[in-house]
C-alpha cells in the first residue's frame, strides 16, 4: 500500500497528491494508479435554514498547500479546527518497537492479500477466471520519466446543476497511471468541490496488472473568486400594499452551494436594514418580498453566501414606494 498520501489543493481546479512508496513492496513498484471521484455535498447542508439565529455556516475548508514535504497535518478531517493542530511528541522505545511489528505485519498481510484474496486481472479476453468487475480502461502514458499528463474530469461530470453529482460507474471514473514518481497533479476539477482519491501501487504492468489495496485520501479544491457573485440585474416589482418583490438570478456555478442570500436595503435618510433569504425561501420567490415599506426612495443590494463564504454585493438597485392609500386600486403592477 502506498504510504502517507497527502492531498492539497493549490488552485480552484487542481489537487496535488503526494505519497511515499510502500515500505516493503512485493517486488518492484512499476507504477501507481490514481483514481478520483467527485463527492456529493452532505445532504444535511440542504436541509438546514442558515437564516435561523445561532446557526453557523458549515466549516468547509479547502485543502491548503503543503507547508513542508513531510507535513501530514492536512490529512485531518476538513471539519477539524486548524487551531487545534499541535506538534507530535518524541516516540518512546515501545512505540518504535510497535511500529516495527506493524511494518512486519503489513508486509505479511499484503502478501496474503496478493496470493489469496486478489486474483490477477486478465487483460486478454481468453477463458479462465476473470475479474468480474468491469476492466479499468487506462489511458496509458507510456513509460515517460517524470511527465504526467492530467486528464480533465469535465467530461466525466456534465454540468447539469450546481448540486447534483452524477454517480458514474467504476469504469468511467477518471484515473491516471503514474510512472517513476510519487506525486501527481490532478487538473480540470470543479472549484470548491470535495474529491475522494484512491491510490494503488502496482508491481507488474503486463500481461497482468497486480496492484495493492487502495489507500484513500480526500481533498477539496479551492474556491473560485467570482463564482458566488450574483450576475445580472436585481429586478423589482411593486404590488399593492407596498409589497416589493425583488428578483435575481442565482450564481450558476457557486462554490459548493448557495446557503443563503443577504438583502441589504435602506430608505433614503434611514439606517440600512438587512434581510436573510434562505435557499428554500429563494426557491419559492426566485428572490424575496419586502413588505410594509414606508413611502420613499429605496436602494437595495444583495449578496450570496456559499459554503466558501460571501460573494460580492450587487450594484445598488433603486425603487420608489408611493403612499398606496393615495393611489387608485387598479394601478398597473
Amino acid at each position: 500500500v502506498p504510504l502517507d498520501p497527502i492531498s492539497v489543493s493549490n488552485s480552484s481546479s487542481q489537487i496535488i497528491l503526494k505519497w511515499k512508496p510502500p515500505s516493503d513492496p512485493n517486488g518492484n513498484i512499476t507504477h501507481y494508479l490514481v483514481f478520483w471521484e467527485r463527492q456529493a455535498e452532505d445532504s444535511e447542508l440542504f436541509e438546514l435554514d442558515y437564516c435561523l439565529k445561532g446557526l453557523k455556516l458549515p466549516s468547509r475548508t479547502w485543502s491548503p498547500p503543503f507547508e513542508s514535504e513531510d507535513s501530514q497535518k492536512h490529512n485531518q478531517s476538513e471539519y477539524e479546527d486548524s487551531a487545534g493542530e499541535c506538534c507530535s511528541c518524541p516516540k518512546t522505545d515501545s512505540q518504535i518497537l510497535k511500529e516495527l511489528e506493524e511494518s512486519s505485519f503489513r508486509k505479511t498481510f499484503e502478501d496474503y492479500l496478493h496470493n489469496v484474496v486478489f486474483v490477477p486481472r486478465k487483460t486478454s479476453s481468453g477463458t479462465g477466471a476473470e475479474d468480474p468487475r468491469p476492466s479499468r480502461k487506462r489511458r496509458s502514458l507510456g513509460d515517460v520519466g517524470n511527465v504526467t499528463v492530467a486528464v480533465p474530469t469535465v467530461a466525466a461530470f456534465p454540468n447539469t446543476s450546481s448540486t447534483s453529482v452524477p454517480t458514474s460507474p467504476e469504469e468511467h471514473r477518471p484515473f491516471e497511471k503514474v510512472v517513476n514518481k510519487e506525486s501527481l497533479v490532478i487538473s480540470g476539477l470543479r472549484h470548491f468541490t470535495g474529491y475522494r482519491i484512491e491510490l494503488q501501487a502496482c508491481n507488474q504492468d503486463t500481461p497482468e496488472e497486480r496492484c495493492s489495496v487502495a489507500a484513500y485520501v480526500s481533498a477539496r479544491t479551492m474556491p473560485e473568486a467570482k463564482a458566488d457573485d450574483i450576475v445580472g440585474p436585481v429586478t423589482h416589482e411593486i404590488f399593492e400594499n407596498n409589497v416589493v418583490h425583488l428578483m435575481w438570478q442565482e450564481p450558476k456555478e457557486p462554490n459548493g452551494l448557495i446557503v443563503l442570500y443577504e438583502v441589504s436595503y435602506r430608505r433614503y435618510g434611514d439606517e440600512e436594514l438587512h434581510l436573510c433569504v434562505s435557499r428554500k425561501h429563494f426557491a419559492l420567490e426566485r428572490g424575496c418580498r419586502l413588505r410594509g415599506l414606508s413611502p420613499g426612495n429605496y436602494s437595495v443590494r444583495i449578496r450570496a453566501t456559499s459554503l466558501a463564504g460571501n460573494g460580492s454585493w450587487t450594484e445598488p438597485t433603486y425603487f420608489y414606494v408611493t403612499d398606496y392609500l393615495d393611489v387608485p386600486s387598479n394601478i398597473a403592477k
Epitope: 447539469t160 416589482e237 409589497v243
Partner: antibody, heavy 116, light 108 residues
C-alpha cells in the same frame, strides 16, 4: 434537460392504499419545490400541495389536508403522493410539477382509477 | 382560500387577437401564471411573472395585470392554440396556490 417522470397508471379498489412517484432529473432536485395537481375526468386543475425536497417542508390545500400525504426522498430525487385509503372519488389524473416562478415542467401524469 | 375566476369558453377567428382574463384578490399581491393544456396532454407553462415566456413559447403569447385581474393575450391566434387555458396564483398568504376554473379556447 429538466424532466419529471411519473410512475405508471394504477387501478385500485376502494379502501386500498397507494403511493405514486415523480422522479426529477437534469436539475438540483433539492433546490426546487414540487407541487401536485389533480385533474378529475373532464374537469379543471386543482392544486393539492407542495413540498420542498431539501427539508421536506410541505404545504397542503385545505381541500386535501388529511386526505393525502406528500413526501420526498432526495437521495433518489423522487417526490411521492400517497393515500392510505382510496375512495372512488379519487379517480383522476395526478400531475407533479416543479415550481420556478411558475409550474414547469410537468410530469406526464399518473392516472389513478379507483373502482370496486 | 382565494378563488380565481375565468370565463368558461372564448372563441377567436384564426389570426385574430384574443384576451383571456382571470380575476381574484390574490392577483393584487401575486402575478398569475398561465398554462395551456391540450386534450390528453399535461399542462404547459406559457406565461409567468409580469410577462415572461418560457423558452419555446411563441411570442404571440403575452401577459398583463391590473388590480385584481390578470390577462393572457394571444396576438394572431393559430389553430394549434386551441386548448384549455388555466390561470394560477399563490393565494394572499403566499403559502398555497389556486387554479382558475379554466377557459376553453376555440379557434374558428
Amino acid at each position: 434537460e429538466v424532466q419529471l417522470v411519473q410512475s405508471g397508471a394504477e387501478v385500485k379498489k376502494p379502501g386500498e392504499s397507494l403511493k405514486i412517484s415523480c422522479k426529477g432529473s437534469g436539475y438540483s432536485f433539492t433546490s426546487y419545490w414540487i407541487g401536485w395537481v389533480r385533474q378529475m375526468p373532464g374537469k379543471g386543475l386543482e392544486w393539492m400541495g407542495i413540498i420542498y425536497p431539501g427539508d421536506s417542508d410541505t404545504r397542503y390545500s385545505p381541500s386535501f389536508q388529511g386526505q393525502v400525504t406528500i413526501s420526498a426522498d432526495k437521495s433518489i430525487s423522487t417526490a411521492y403522493l400517497q393515500w392510505s385509503s382510496l375512495k372512488a372519488s379519487d379517480t383522476a389524473m395526478y400531475y407533479c410539477a416543479r415550481w420556478d416562478a411558475g409550474y414547469s415542467p410537468w410530469g406526464q401524469g399518473t392516472l389513478v382509477t379507483v373502482s370496486s | 382560500s382565494s378563488e380565481l375566476t375565468q370565463d368558461p369558453a372564448v372563441s377567436v377567428a384564426l389570426g385574430q387577437t384574443v384576451r383571456i382574463t382571470c380575476q381574484g384578490d390574490s392577483l393584487r399581491s401575486y402575478y398569475a401564471s398561465w398554462y395551456q393544456q391540450k386534450p390528453g396532454q399535461a399542462p404547459v407553462l406559457v406565461i409567468y411573472g409580469k410577462n415572461n415566456r418560457p423558452s419555446g413559447i411563441p411570442d404571440r403569447f403575452s401577459g398583463s395585470s391590473s388590480g385584481n385581474t390578470a390577462s393572457l393575450t394571444i396576438t394572431g391566434a393559430q389553430a394549434e392554440d386551441e386548448a384549455d387555458y388555466y390561470c394560477s396564483s399563490r393565494d394572499s398568504s403566499g403559502d398555497q396556490w389556486v387554479f382558475g376554473g379554466g377557459t376553453k379556447l376555440t379557434v374558428l
